[in-house]
Amino acid sequence: MSSKYPRSVRRCLPLWALTLEAALILLFYFFTHYDASLEDQKGLVASYQVGQDLTVMAAIGLGFLTSSFRRHSWSSVAFNLFMLALGVQWAILLDGFLSQFPSGKVVITLFSIRLATMSALSVLISVDAVLGKVNLAQLVVMVLVEVTALGNLRMVISNIFNTDYHMNMMHIYVFAAYFGLSVAWCLPKPLPEGTEDKDQTATIPSLSAMLGALFLWMFWPSFNSALLRSPIERKNAVFNTYYAVAVSVVTAISGSSLAHPQGKISKTYVHSAVLAGGVAVGTSCHLIPSPWLAMVLGLVAGLISVGGAKYLPGCCNRVLGIPHSSIMGYNFSLLGLLGEIIYIVLLVLDTVGAGNGMIGFQVLLSIGELSLAIVIALMSGLLTGLLLNLKIWKAPHEAKYFDDQVFWKFPHLAVGF
C-alpha cells in the first residue's frame, strides 16, 4: 500500500513552513545588516572555523546520533537538518532583537551565527525525546518555542545574574534535556501492538548513530570553548574537554561491558556515554586547572551515563513514552546537572577558602540560575507539548510512530528498507 503524508498535512506543512520562511526573509530584510568593518582575513577564517565546527556537530553529529531506529533513520537525520536550518535563522533574529535592537538594526557577525547555532543545538538535543512521534509541522512549532524560550532565558540570566555568554549558554544541556522530557511527557505515550519493532535499533542505522557520536566527540572541545573571551580560557576549555571526553569513552565502553551479564557492550550506552565528559565539564571547562581533574570528571560522567542508560530507560519508557534508544534526554539532564553542581562546588570551595560572604552570595545566584533554567525548560516544554497535541498539526497516528514511510518517498516501499 502506498505510504504518503495524510492529505491534510500535505496542505498544512508546506504552507506553514513556507509562510514562516517568507516572514523570516522579511524580518531579515527590514531589521538586519552585515557587520561592515574590514577584518583581518586570517582572523576571519579562524573565527569561521569555530562556527563550522558547531555546524558539523549539529548537522552531522546530532543528526546521525538520533538515527539509530530501524525504520526512522532518514527522518531523524533530515528532520534534524530542517530544525537546525530553521532554528539558526530564528535564533539570529531573536538574539539580535533581545540584545541589539535599540540601535535600530541587528548586526550579523560570525559570532552571532555561532551563538545562533548553539541555540539551535538545544532543539536538536531536546527533539531526541520526541522524534518518531511528531511530524515536521509539529517540529516547526517546537523549534520556534524552544529557541524563543532559550533566548529569553539567556537574556534574563544575563540581566539578573550578570552572567557572560559562556556561562549562560552552558545551561543549554539542562534546559534542552528538561524541555525535551516535558514535551515527551505531553505526547501520547503507549506504543500500540505491532509497532514494537520500529523503535528497535538496527545495525546500519546504529553505525550511523556511532558516526554521529564520533563527530560530536571530535568537536565537543569547540562547543565548550566557542564563547570564551580570551585565548587562555579557550585553551584550557579545549584541553579539559578533550581529557574529559577521552576518559568518558574508556569508561563508557568498559562500564557498558561491566553492566552486561555476559560482559557485552551496548551500542546505546556507548552512543551517549562517549559524550558524557564533554557535557559534565561544560560549565567549568575553562576553570579546571589540571588534566587529572578533568579526567576524574570524565570518569564520573561516564559511569553516571552508563548507570543512567541501564536503569532509567524503563522508567522513561513507562512515564514519558521515550524509547530505550532515545537516551539523550535523561543522559543530558543528569550530566548537565552534574556539570552545574561541579561549578557550584567550585564556588563553595571558594567560600570555604575565603570566608567571604560575597562568594556565598554568588553560590546562591548560581543555584538561582540553575533553578530558573529548569523551571523555564519545564514550563516552556509543557506549553510546547500542549501545542503539539492540537489537532491542527495532524500528528502521526500511534501506529505510524517511528516510520520513515509516513514521511518519505521510497521507490520500492519494502518493509525492511
Epitope: 582572523g43 544575563s158 552572567t163 556561562m167 573571551r229 567549568s284 567550585l346
Partner: antibody, heavy 129, light 111 residues
Framework: QVQLVESGGGVVQPGRSLRLSCAAS????????MHWVRQAPGKGLEWVAV????????NYADSVKGRFTISRDNSKNTLYLQMNSLRAEDTAVYYC??????????????????????WGQGTTVTVSS | QTVVTQEPSLTVSPGGTVTLTCASS?????????PNWFQQKPGQAPRALIY???NKHSWTPARFSGSLLGGKAALTLSGVQPEDEAEYYC???????????FGGGTILTVL
C-alpha cells in the same frame, strides 16, 4: 616596551564620519582584546567598545551602538574605530586600551582577571559646525 | 541604564588613610564584576592601579589596595602622599550585557 598610539582625531561637522586608528607595539597584539574609551571635556571616562582578540565578537556602549564600529587588523597590529553620524556629544579625547589578560590558579580552579592595563595617550575628536 | 556611583570628592591629609567606594545600581558588587581602579592626573591618560578586585599591577605602589566592602568595591590608600592627588575611576564589568561601565570618578584632594 608596550605602547599604544592613537591617531585620526580632528574637527568634524555633525553627521559626518571619522576613523580612528590605534597602532600597537611591544606585545603580541593578536592575543589581546582591545577597548576604546572616551572622555568628554571636563567629564569622566566612558567606555565605548571592545573587540575580542580574534575579532569574532564586538560590544558597544548604548550611546554609540549602531553608529560606531570597532574593528582590528591583527596582521597590521592596528585597532580601528569607525565613527559615523557624529554628534556634538561625541566630542572627547578617545583612548585605546589593552584588555587585561591574566590568571592565577589554586589546586581546584583557575581565576581569570579582566580589566584594562595599558592605555594610549589619546586623540581628540571635536564635533562642531 | 546601569549606573556606577562613586563619591564625587574626598579630602585626606598627607600620611592619612582614605577609602574610595564604587557601587552598582544593579545591586551588590561581587568579584564577578572584576572591579578595576584607575588614577588620572590632569592632562594625562588614565593609569591602571588595581584589577579584578584586589590585584596590583607591577607599577602600583604598595599603599594602594582593593577590596569588596559591604556590597561595594573599595580602593584604600594608606599613608597618602601628595602625588596621590588625582581623580580615581572605578570600572565594573557587566558580563551579562558584555559591557564595561566606569564610575563618575572621585577627586581626591591631599591637604
Amino acid at each position: 616596551q608596550v605602547q599604544l598610539v592613537e591617531s585620526g582625531g580632528g574637527v568634524v561637522q555633525p553627521g559626518r564620519s571619522l576613523r580612528l586608528s590605534c597602532a600597537a607595539s611591544g606585545f603580541t597584539f593578536s592575543t589581546y582584546g582591545m577597548h576604546w574609551v572616551r572622555q568628554a571635556p571636563g567629564k569622566g571616562l566612558e567606555w565605548v567598545a571592545v573587540i575580542w582578540y580574534d575579532g569574532s565578537n564586538k560590544n558597544y556602549a548604548d550611546s554609540v551602538k549602531g553608529r560606531f564600529t570597532i574593528s582590528r587588523d591583527n596582521s597590521k597590529n592596528t585597532l580601528y574605530l569607525q565613527m559615523n553620524s557624529l554628534r556634538a556629544e561625541d566630542t572627547a579625547v578617545y583612548y585605546c586600551a589593552r584588555d587585561l589578560q591574566g590568571y592565577r590558579s589554586s589546586w581546584y580552579r583557575m581565576y581569570y582577571y579582566y580589566g584594562m592595563d595599558v592605555w594610549g595617550q589619546g586623540t581628540t575628536v571635536t564635533v562642531s559646525s | 541604564q546601569t549606573v556606577v556611583t562613586q563619591e564625587p570628592s574626598l579630602t585626606v591629609s598627607p600620611g592619612g588613610t582614605v577609602t574610595l567606594t564604587c557601587a552598582s545600581s544593579t545591586g551588590a558588587v561581587t568579584s564577578g564584576y572584576y572591579p578595576n581602579w584607575f588614577q588620572q592626573k590632569p592632562g594625562q591618560a588614565p593609569r591602571a592601579l588595581i584589577y579584578s578586585t584586589s590585584n596590583k599591577h607591577s607599577w602600583t605602589p604598595a599603599r594602594f589596595s582593593g577590596s569588596l566592602l559591604g556590597g561595594k568595591a573599595a580602593l584604600t590608600l594608606s599613608g597618602v602622599q601628595p602625588e596621590d592627588e588625582a581623580e580615581y575611576y572605578c570600572l565594573l564589568y557587566y558580563g551579562g550585557a558584555q559591557r564595561w561601565v566606569f564610575g563618575g570618578g572621585t577627586i581626591l584632594t591631599v591637604l
